[in-house]
Structure formats: C-alpha cells, structure tokens
C-alpha cells in the first residue's frame, strides 16, 4: 500500500474497497463526534508516512474499551502485514507527543485525503 | 443543513468573462472538494472541473482549459469558478457542488446559475 | 476518458411500472458509478452512489446494481413525481464524466 492506490501510474485510481471503508469509517467518526472520542483518552502521534497504517494501529490499540474506534482498529489490521499488540511501538512514532484520539482521527483522514488527490489537483 | 447558495443569473457578451459565486454553508468548508457542472438548454451534464478548497489544488476539464479558473475564499466559504472569452455556447446554468473525495457522489447541489451569452 | 453511454435516450411508461435503465462505461470502473435524478427547472439530485448504495431519504423503490462496464437504476414501480431525467456519473477517473441521460416520460 506504499502506492496508495495507484498515484504513482499515470492518471488517478481510486482506493480498494477496504481503503475506501477506512476513509468512509474515518469520516463518520469526525462528523458523529458528540461527546468527547473515547473520553478524550491521548495516543501516541505518528509521523504520516509509509508504514503510517502499522503505526496507526499500534498509537489506537492502546486504547481499549471505545468501541467508537473498534472498527478502525480492525480496518487498519488489515492494512497492517505483521500482528499488533498494545505497548507496540515503531521508529514511526512521535513519542514526546501524545494528541487526543478525536484529533489522530482526524489527522490521518486529511492525510488520506491528501494522497488521494495527489497527482489530479494540480 | 448543508447548503450551496449560487449568484444569480447574468448576460454576457461574447468574448467576455463571468465570475459565478458559490457560497456554503452547514459543514467545515474546507472537507470538500467544490466541483462545477454545467448544463446547456436542453442539454446534459457536463462536468467543468474542480477544487480543493484546504490546499487551493485544482482539476480542469480539458475542454475548458485555459478559459476557466476556478478559487475559494474559506474566510466566506465561498468558491468562485470564472469563465472566460465566452462564446454563445457557453450559455447554460452552471452548477456548484460538493464531493468529499473526486470518487464520492455529488451529494449537494447549488440552485445552478444561468449564464446568456449573446450579442 | 470514460465515456458513459445511456440507454434508452427516452422510456415511455405508466405509473405504476417497473422501469429499467442502462449505463454503460467504456471501461472497467468497477463500482464508481453514480445515478442523479432531475427534474425541469432543479439542480440534479442523488440517488444512489457506488453503483448500487442507497441514500437516505430516497424512496426504496430506487435500486442499483451492476459493476465493472453495465450499470442498472431499476424504479420498482413508477410514481408521478418519478418522470424526470436520469444520469449516471463516472466517479472512477478524472475527468468525471456523465451519461447522456434517460428520459422517463408518461406514455
């Protein structure tokens, strides 16, 4: 998935099914947010690059007991070659800076967005 | 509730330029893609291009290349798409809309603006 | 760029009927395709995305199917409000293109 759905080939291609559910799934969390996102628990911040899924999901898995991200965790298990466990952490992570779950939401969505209009909005 | 207010209608002369306006409302402006799609009477759909509000990055049809520009102002929230060196084929309503992502539908629609072009 | 190609230009039909319409694409989209309805005088509106998902608000007699190059928009059983112009839209590629149209009229 380095390729992120083609944007190194000519011409935009648009993202797998399950990426497409992971950017769907991110996008109704941002916009259902009421109460504060797993009661305002902190995770780790990443740095957004290539292995940012495997590092997603190792800063989230943390977090136990919100079933508001239960479904991220498993989409990105998917996106994630090796397994998972909490207190698992790569060279990706920021770790002198913790950030709100809502707002790591919210920042690996723009990220994808970003990439995904890459290579079409000059 | 989301909402796309268009400018009203305009009479150009051929060879000059009209600037539609495209004011949102009801969601974080910057989240969407604002696409433009015009109809000419009688006509079908026919997509213009597109722009991406939080970076300013835009995606032209090639048929309008080099006529059109289009711009945000996420101050209003508000888009703006310009046509220029019109010619009587241009006469349509034009249309604002969003999309979340270029692969998403277009879920709202503005009233369209309706653009006479003649002499 | 992806040509969309809709088919019949014009169905006459009763309230009442099932209405079937056709969308065809130049090439493989897979799901990326989108049907809007419009009536005289309005902006178009959405109706079902990614070939066959439904949206809230649209009555259930609307559905979608289809995948790859053949799309269907199926109206169960026509209501008046129903006779308007239907598109299909090519969410696949740039530059987003759309179909010709179909327009359902009253026979």
């Known amino acids: 998935l380095t390729c992120l759905g083609g944007f190194a080939s000519p011409g935009p291609v648009p993202p797998s099914t399950a990426l497409r559910e992971l950017i769907e799934e991110l996008v109704n969390i941002t916009q259902n947010q009421k109460a504060p996102l797993c009661n305002g628990s902190m995770v780790w911040s990443i740095n957004l690059t290539a292995g940012m899924y495997c590092a997603a999901l190792e800063s989230l898995i943390n977090v136990s007991g919100c079933s508001a991200i239960e479904k991220t965790q498993r989409m990105l298990s998917g996106f994630c070659p090796h397994k998972v466990s909490a207190g698992q952490f790569s060279s990706l992570h920021v770790r002198d800076t913790k950030i709100e779950v809502a707002q790591f939401v919210k920042d690996l969505l723009l990220h994808l967005k970003k990439l995904f209009r890459e290579g079409q909005f000059n | 509730q989301v909402q796309l207010v268009q400018s009203g209608a305009e009479v150009k002369k051929p060879g000059a330029s009209v600037k539609v306006s495209c004011k949102a409302s009801g969601y974080t402006f910057i989240d969407y893609e604002i696409h433009w799609v015009r109809q000419a009477p009688g006509q079908g759909l026919e997509w213009m291009g597109a722009?991406?509000?939080?970076?300013?990055?835009?995606a032209y049809n090639q048929k309008f290349k080099g006529r059109v520009t289009m711009t945000t102002d996420t101050s209003t929230s508000t888009a703006y798409m310009e046509l220029r060196s019109l010619r009587s084929d241009d006469t349509a309503v034009y249309y604002c809309?969003?999309?979340?992502?270029?692969?998403?539908?277009?879920?709202?629609w503005g009233q369209g603006t309706l653009v006479t072009v003649s002499s | 760029e992806i040509v969309l190609t809709q088919s019949p230009a014009t169905l006459s039909l009763s309230p009442g009927e099932r209405a079937t319409l056709s969308c065809r694409a130049s090439?493989?989209?897979?799901?990326?395709l989108h049907w809007y309805q419009q009536k005289p005088g309005q902006a178009p509106r959405l109706l079902i995305y990614?070939?066959?998902q439904s949206i809230s608000g649209i009555p259930a007699r609307f559905s979608g199917s289809g995948s790859g190059t053949d799309f269907t928009l199926t109206i169960s059983s026509l209501e008046p409000e129903d006779f308007a112009v239907y598109y299909c839209q090519n969410g696949h590629s740039f530059p987003l293109t759309l179909g010709g149209g179909t327009k359902v009229e009253i026979k």
């Open positions: 809309t969003r999309i979340l992502l270029y692969y998403y539908p277009m879920d709202y």
């Open positions: 722009i991406d509000p939080e970076t300013g990055g835009t």
């Open positions: 090439q493989n989209i897979s799901d990326y």
């Open positions: 990614y070939a066959s």
